[in-house]
């Protein structure tokens, strides 16, 4: 027999299957060109001195063999005596150590046995009822396939799985989805219903993230508020990177975890937009307002758990920057303007009350007045800061009020609302003899003293009822006592105290009469 032909004679070894565990297996035969065919197989066991024979039986019952020698792959043409148009049965017999080992048989029509392509192009990945669904377009003119997948994690070897038979222009596969680790998948195809057909190559890796994106483990710090009324939010610790399987390292589309920063500005609730979402890499500047910050991790399956922080408001106050004038029509605030066409947000809340009770007002964009000041006015009827109590005021500014990260703090200060002159009047003024020509005057602290920076000073007035002479004595806002000296015995005096702010003179307390008794010597 010629080596290129299938030999229709008895093979040159005895016909007896040893039934040993070793031997040829996994025979695959397919068409490799218009007129050529190839069969390949695996051999389990020691290969020294093994001769392989590819056996073939035609539908007529006639059988032949090709001698492959030590090779486990053999090619032949459509002229080799094997009927390619009709079904044939093929198997391998390996002669080794004076015994014959046989592979399982495959029955196929060689003509139609073409090697399939793996899934090509875009493999779409989605989540379906806790499983992974992969879908791809069937390679052209290869409808009708068996599909297998293999998958691995960073710490586990390949595991094989079955997608089942496919018979459409699109093919799909349901695969296991891991909760917390990334996976690499590969797919392969072979002709449906042809037991000896050859598997395609494995597809390119499909990299799949875990169902749950990793929780971000990050830490922030906030810088001091700068001269421009803004402070930088900085990331102290980058989020941990997801561990990837071998084939997904480097460029691994599909496994990316994106971290987004969600800012919620709690102060100034009357502004248009309270929240903004940014990429974590782009750390923003913030005003001195209070914020809630969340870092949200997400992958192609959606968002995961987030981490949240509260950034408290910067409470550094500027006691002199705000001027307030109270007139008959209402109240006007003045402060140094930031720039042209700025929108300001004025926020106030009673001191010692929950931050949720803050009230605010948004101005229309305004330019500085000739003195370089910005203003905000309100009428008494509006009720704004109308109660006689201490308010904490913060003013924010922005040229783009719709952009959350472009607000800056102009100033923070305290203001006593309502009729501060009257409300601030000191009560419980008392006079005690101190010496032969002096007295000690005491009073209860003014309500204004509860408002940091508002009370500029106390003024104590002493009036000589005989001569009608008046003397005034300034007293530090932290003091509630003064000694009046140089007084004459037997003279009637009245004493009054008032509390002044930077922009308002207080109302005198009720006059308190006293005199120093004349000392009679024995």
């Amino acid at each position: 027999c010629r080596t290129s032909e299938c030999c229709f004679q008895d093979p040159p070894y005895p016909d007896a299957d040893s039934g040993s565990a070793s031997g040829p297996r996994d025979l695959r035969c397919y068409r490799i060109s218009s007129d050529r065919y190839e069969c390949s197989w695996q051999y389990e066991g020691p290969t020294a001195g093994v001769s392989h024979f590819l056996r073939c039986c035609l539908s007529s019952g006639r059988c032949c063999y090709f001698a492959a020698g030590s090779a486990t792959r053999l090619q032949f043409s459509d002229q080799a005596g094997v009927s390619v148009l009709y079904t044939v049965t093929l198997w391998v017999e390996s002669w080794a150590r004076n015994q014959t080992e046989k592979s399982p048989e495959v029955t196929l029509q060689l003509y139609n046995s073409v090697k399939y392509e793996p899934p090509l192009g875009d493999i779409k990945v989605s989540k379906l009822a806790g499983q992974l669904r992969m879908e791809w377009e069937t390679p052209d003119n290869q409808v009708g396939a068996e599909v297998q997948f293999r998958h691995r994690t960073p710490s586990s070897p390949w595991k094989l799985g079955d997608c089942g038979p496919q018979d459409d222009d699109t093919e799909s596969c349901l695969c296991p989805l891991e909760m917390n680790v990334a996976q690499e998948f590969q797919l392969r195809r072979r002709q449906l219903g042809s037991q000896g057909s050859s598997w395609s190559k494995w597809s390119s890796p499909v990299c799949v993230p875990p169902e749950n994106p990793p929780q971000p483990q990050v830490r922030f710090s906030v810088e001091q508020l700068g001269q421009d009324g803004r402070r930088r939010l900085t990331l102290k610790e980058q989020p941990t990177q997801l561990e990837l399987p071998e084939g997904c390292q480097g460029l691994a589309p599909g496994t990316e975890v994106t971290y987004r920063l969600q800012l919620h500005m709690l102060s100034c609730p009357c502004k248009a937009k309270a929240t903004r979402t940014l990429h974590l890499g782009k750390m923003p500047y913030l005003s001195g307002a209070a914020y809630n910050v969340a870092v949200i991790s997400s992958n192609q399956f959606g968002p995961g758990l987030n981490q949240t922080w509260h950034i408290p408001a910067d409470t550094h106050t500027e006691p002199v920057a705000l001027n307030i004038s109270v007139g008959t029509n209402g109240t006007t605030m003045y402060w140094p303007a930031r720039a042209q066409s700025m929108t300001y947000c004025i926020e106030w809340q009673p001191v010692g009350q929950d931050g949720g009770l803050a009230t605010c007002s948004l101005t229309a964009p305004q330019d500085p007045d000739p003195a370089g000041m910005a203003t905000y006015s309100w009428s008494r009827e509006s009720g704004a800061m109308g109660q006689e109590k201490c308010y904490y005021i913060t003013i924010f500014a922005s040229a783009h009020p719709e952009k959350l990260t472009l607000w800056s703090t102009v100033l923070s200060t305290y203001h006593f609302g309502g009729n501060a002159s009257a409300a601030g009047t000191p009560h419980h003024v008392s006079v005690k003899n101190h010496s032969l020509d002096s007295v000690s005057v005491d009073w209860a602290p003014s309500l204004l003293s509860t408002c940091p920076g508002v009370l500029k000073e106390y003024v104590v007035r002493c009036r000589d009822e005989d001569s009608k002479q008046v003397s005034e004595h300034p007293v530090q806002p932290t003091e509630t006592q003064v000694t009046l000296s140089g007084l004459r015995a037997g003279v009637a005096y009245t004493v009054q105290v008032r509390a002044d702010t930077a922009w308002l003179r207080g109302v005198w307390s009720q006059p308190q009469r006293f005199s120093i008794e004349v000392q009679v010597s024995d």
Partner: nanobody, 127 residues
């Protein structure tokens, strides 16, 4: 569904050449192979040749081997199969039909393996 339309038939001298085309449209990705058959009056359709579309593998009847060549061109949703005929003989005169199959079982030479057929185009070889 798949639609097949043949073109290119006509009258040609003995020894001449002719190229037939078959345009397939519709659900073309599901076709695995396309073939040419021919028929003369009063006789059964005779296999000429076939091409496996995904690989371009061809197979010919002995009567045309070496003279006829089948090729194909793929575009989006259409496939065109060609039959290039050289050294034509009078016995090549027939109506030539284009056929398509969607299954991998069966031999190419049997008409019953093909689900789709064209209307046919006449080829006349005159001496």
């Amino acid at each position: 569904e798949v639609q097949l339309v043949e073109s290119g038939g006509g009258l040609v001298q003995t020894g001449g050449s002719l190229r037939l085309s078959c345009a397939a449209s519709g659900r073309t990705p599901s076709i695995v192979a396309m073939g040419w058959f021919r028929q003369t009056p009063g006789k059964e359709r005779e296999f000429v040749g076939e091409i496996i579309l995904s690989k371009g593998f061809t197979y010919y009847a002995d009567s045309v081997k070496g003279r006829f060549t089948i090729s194909r061109a793929n575009a989006k949703n259409t496939i065109t199969m060609y039959l290039q005929m050289h050294s034509l003989k009078s016995e090549d005169s027939a109506v030539y039909y284009c056929a398509a199959r969607q299954n991998w079982s069966g031999g190419p030479t049997r008409t019953n393996e093909y689900e789709y057929w064209g209307q046919g185009t006449q080829v006349t070889v005159s001496s």
